[in-house]
Interface confidence: low
């Protein structure tokens, strides 16, 4: 039989590549029963995840499962880090894996490093 | 009943890129995830990568600089694009759907196979 | 990555003999995020398990799978004629989603 417990369907080490500039949507895959979570983003930073408050966000409903997207519109080269998405289900605060945004500016985006140089030095990200 | 079916070259020059389709009947394209997945010839399953409906996709790592999957909801197909191959990517390559048990993901969809040779 | 490494390469048995295939992470996982699959020749592969114990769909109740942590276990309990293939355990705690180079089971 099928938990009815609520899943957040994001995988460990997922990522995304991305430019600054374009519009991106970032989807947290929500599976439940019968009442819908409350569901937020946050964002990384150190030991901490600082909750996206003031971020546009929606929901779309599929038949197997739903989405909860992070919008970016547009991506902005502060847009880069790690993020990962929250339910709170009967009293209980369910967190997803997280997933990261790899951004690159437009203005070095034919210079564009190599994940493995993003991964050792990530102040190329910054550039 | 989920039927897929891989279509494409069964035969690729070195350094040329491998080009593959999935066709999906029996059900929607929609509110899924797609794999694919190969076999060498005589080896074992080697995760490529998935993609979304909406376009999300995530790549194996040691094949990410070459691969990349494509999604065309209109026909009910995902493709997939292997740039640079070489010998070492002559295998049995299957697509396949990924179900979101509550469990996890597993793939319990499978396209019969097609044999891509890379030899010149 | 995760490496999944499944012992032994190949197994003779009988039909009507019990099956163990083990299979080994290279590091811990979550016991929801392990799969078996079946595979006969000339086929694709065939979701047996997933969350290490749950049978899919039209399993036949003779295949049970058990484990937890780095090791998992695919049994069979009475080895029938269309069971000898080969059989693939497959992780999805982490990506890249990673197989095991598989286990034959084949006629004594």
């Known amino acids: 039989k099928e938990s009815c417990d609520v899943q957040l369907y994001i995988k460990r080490q997922s990522e995304h590549s991305i430019l600054a500039g374009d519009p991106f949507e970032l989807e947290c895959p929500v599976k439940y029963c019968a009442n819908r979570p409350h569901v937020t983003w946050c964002k990384l930073n150190g030991t901490t995840c600082v909750k996206l408050e003031d971020r546009q966000t929606s929901w779309k409903e599929e038949k197997n499962i739903s989405f909860f997207i992070l919008h970016f519109e547009p991506v902005l080269p502060n847009d880069n880090g790690s993020y990962r998405c929250s339910a709170n289900f009967q009293s209980n605060l369910i967190e997803s894996h997280s997933t990261t945004l790899y951004v690159t500016d437009v203005k070095s985006a034919s210079e564009r490093p190599s994940k493995d140089e993003m991964a050792s030095r990530p102040w190329l990200l910054y550039r | 009943q989920v039927q897929l079916q891989e279509s494409g070259p069964g035969l690729v020059k070195p350094s040329e890129t491998l080009s593959l389709t999935c066709t999906v009947s029996?059900?929607?394209?929609?509110?899924?995830?797609w794999s694919w997945i190969r076999q060498p010839p005589g080896k074992g399953l080697e995760w490529i990568g998935y993609?979304?409906?909406?376009?999300?996709?995530n790549y194996n790592p040691s094949l990410k600089s070459r691969v990349t999957i494509s999604v065309d909801t209109s026909k009910n197909q995902f493709s997939l694009k292997l740039s640079s191959v070489t010998a070492a990517d002559t295998a049995v390559y299957y697509c396949?759907?990924?179900?979101?048990?509550?469990?996890?993901?597993?793939?319990?969809?499978w396209g019969q196979g097609t044999l891509v040779t890379v030899s010149s | 990555e995760i490496v999944m490494t499944q012992s032994p390469a190949t197994l003779s048995l009988s039909p009507g003999e019990r099956a163990t295939l083990s299979c080994r992470a290279s590091?811990?996982?979550?016991?929801?995020?392990l799969s078996w699959y079946q595979q006969r020749p000339g086929q694709a592969p065939r979701l047996l398990i997933y969350?290490?114990?749950t049978r899919a769909t039209g399993i036949p109740a003779r295949f049970s799978g058990s484990g937890s942590g780095t090791d998992f276990t695919l049994t069979i309990s009475s080895l029938q004629p269309e069971d000898f293939a080969v059989y693939y355990c497959?992780?999805?705690?982490?990506?890249?989603?990673?197989f095991g180079g598989g286990t034959k089971v084949e006629i004594k």
């Open positions: 497959q992780q999805d705690y982490n990506l890249p989603l990673t």
């Open positions: 396949a759907r990924v179900v979101l048990y509550s469990t996890g993901w597993s793939f319990d969809y």
């Open positions: 029996g059900g929607s394209i929609s509110s899924y995830y």
């Open positions: 969350g290490t114990s």
């Open positions: 590091q811990s996982v979550s016991s929801s995020y």
């Open positions: 993609i979304y409906y909406s376009g999300t996709t």
